[in-house]
Interface confidence: medium
Amino acid sequence: KKVVLGKKGDTVELTCTASQKKSIQFHWKNSNQIKILGNQGSFLTKGPSKLNDRADSRRSLWDQGNFPLIIKNLKIEDSDTYICEVEDQKEEVQLLVFGLTANSDTHLLQGQSLTLTLESPPGSSPSVQCRSPRGKNIQGGKTLSVSQLELQDSGTWTCTVLQNQKKVEFKIDIVVLAFQKASSIVYKKEGEQVEFSFPLAFTVEKLTGSGELWWQAERASSSKSWITFDLKNKEVSVKRVTQDPKLQMGKKLPLHLTLPQALPQYAGSGNLTLALEAKTGKLHQEVNLVVMRATQLQKNLTCEVWGPTSPKLMLSLKLENKEAKVSKREKAVWVLNPEAGMWQCLLSDSGQVLLESNIKVLPTWSTPVQP
């Protein structure tokens, strides 16, 4: 018995060939011996089967001795053994119809899971293998789960259903929605303007949702909401903004925030969340602000940083074009009785300078100048 696999919603063509290359009488029946279709001379006749409006043949092939059964808009329950009766012979074809559906919208947030469910006819025992566009493979039976979706999983997944050594292929488009960066860090001198950017990793025509930036200042005991906003068709509108600091937000994507001045009391970590319309869960991006201040009070030259710095960062004070006077893996360094000249405070990581602040130390009878 020949086995043919079909896809739910598709069209299948079951073949039936006579030895005589001419139009002769034929009938297609199902396993219950109910007539589906046949011919009467050059006319197509249909029987009382449930396939009535979805069954057809190709009259143009009858003269060549080919009498196909075409079934449109396949349903799982169309799975059956179909019998072609021609020239006192019976040709049997077993049709197995499968469907593969996602349990949710296939636009998912990074980190979420996708479950694919295979609809299959009773008595079948198919195996399924799905391959991502970048070569990740998952295997399963009636259900397959892709957990912890990553950006790289975006694209057309190809799922192959295997039954009786025959294959049928399904294509499923998956879009993983995410920010380009999971986290970012901004280094600024005290008083400088701060720009925070939150680019999305995908491009869509219409994007609607709402978002909020929560901020945990290093000096504060609890976090606070700095700004809430709405997003409508890529247009950003601010709903509520804190009085201190007075944040500004760009009106277009990518999401862009401006802090007029970097001050020690603002140094810390923020979490921007974005809830997209018709999506469960939220997109997250962490942002960190490190602020540096160099000061001279009487005979003490001090350099301090505030904010989330890693223990391997080095803070140094040095006189221009000279070796560092002091260099420590700490958040504050100082020099007593600094000599006159341009001093540099440097925050560096493995020799790469992340932040630099200059302070001019004048001879002891004058006051310091901060350029």
Epitope: Q129, N137, T156, V175
Partner: antibody, heavy 116, light 112 residues
Framework: QVQLVQSGAEVKKPGASVKVSCKAS????????ISWVRQAPGQGLEWMGM????????TYAPKFQGRVTMTRDTSTSTVYMELSSLRSEDTAVYYC?????????WGQGTLVTVSS | DIVMTQSPLSLPVTPGEPASISCRSS???????????LDWYLQKPGQSPQLLIY???NRASGVPDRFSGSGSGTDFTLKISRVEAEDVGVYYC?????????FGQGTKVEIK
């Protein structure tokens, strides 16, 4: 950690075949396709084809179709690339890389020299 | 097959200065899902290539944030904000939209 370790350098005569191995470790072998990419001396990168370790299915670049065969051994988490009817222009470093399109981990490369 | 064209083919750089490499594809790499299927790889002298950027603008894990990718459709750019001595090598763009994936000719970045 993820590692792809390839077999050593080979010297072959024109017309012969070469079989290069790539042993994967540090992840589930059947969960990712393995591609082969070659680089002729002083030249750029050229994708040759890929194999899906889970079922052994292959896709080859049209240029290598009929000359290249990719196989896998799931018991040793190893994939193989065999190139036949070698000619001098096949002299290159052959890399295995994890992924079908977009390669996050690469082997160290195997130099194949074709010379009479 | 999609043809990838890079420019310049050679780029002398000064440490601490920015650098930029351009890549153009013969057809759009923007998938209907909103992602651009373009990767950037760096092959340091004597080493295997390594993934820098995937899906046009997303840094691979462990890649310093001085590297950034931008562009959409057929025109893409890889930028290095401040070149370091360890960044020398050949940079390749690669389209990952279709099989077979195809690479640009490569851009050799060397210190002046």
């Amino acid at each position: 950690q993820v590692q792809l370790v390839q077999s050593g350098a080979e010297v072959k005569k024109p017309g012969a075949s070469v079989k290069v191995s790539c042993k994967a470790s540090g992840y589930t072998f059947t969960s990712y396709d393995i591609s082969w990419v070659r680089q002729a001396p002083g030249q750029g990168l050229e994708w040759m084809g890929m194999i899906s370790p889970s079922d052994g299915s292959t896709t080859y670049a049209p240029k290598f179709q009929g000359r290249v065969t990719m196989t896998r051994d799931t018991s040793t988490s190893t994939v193989y690339m065999e190139l036949s009817s070698l000619r001098s222009e096949d002299t290159a470093v052959y890399y295995c890389a994890r992924g079908a399109v977009g390669f996050d981990y690469w082997g160290q490369g195997t130099l194949v020299t074709v010379s009479s | 097959d999609i043809v990838m064209t890079q420019s310049p083919l050679s780029l002398p750089v000064t440490p601490g200065e920015p650098a930029s490499i351009s890549c153009r594809s013969s057809q759009s790499l923007l998938h209907s899902n909103g992602y651009n299927y373009l990767d950037w790889y760096l092959q340091k002298p004597g080493q295997s290539p390594q993934l820098l950027i995937y899906l046009g603008s997303n840094r691979a894990s462990g890649v310093p944030d001085r590297f950034s990718g931008s562009g959409s459709g057929t025109d893409f750019t890889l930028k290095i904000s401040r070149v370091e001595a360890e960044d020398v090598g050949v940079y390749y763009c690669m389209q990952a939209l279709q099989t077979p994936p195809s690479f640009g000719q490569g851009t050799k970045v060397e210190i002046k």
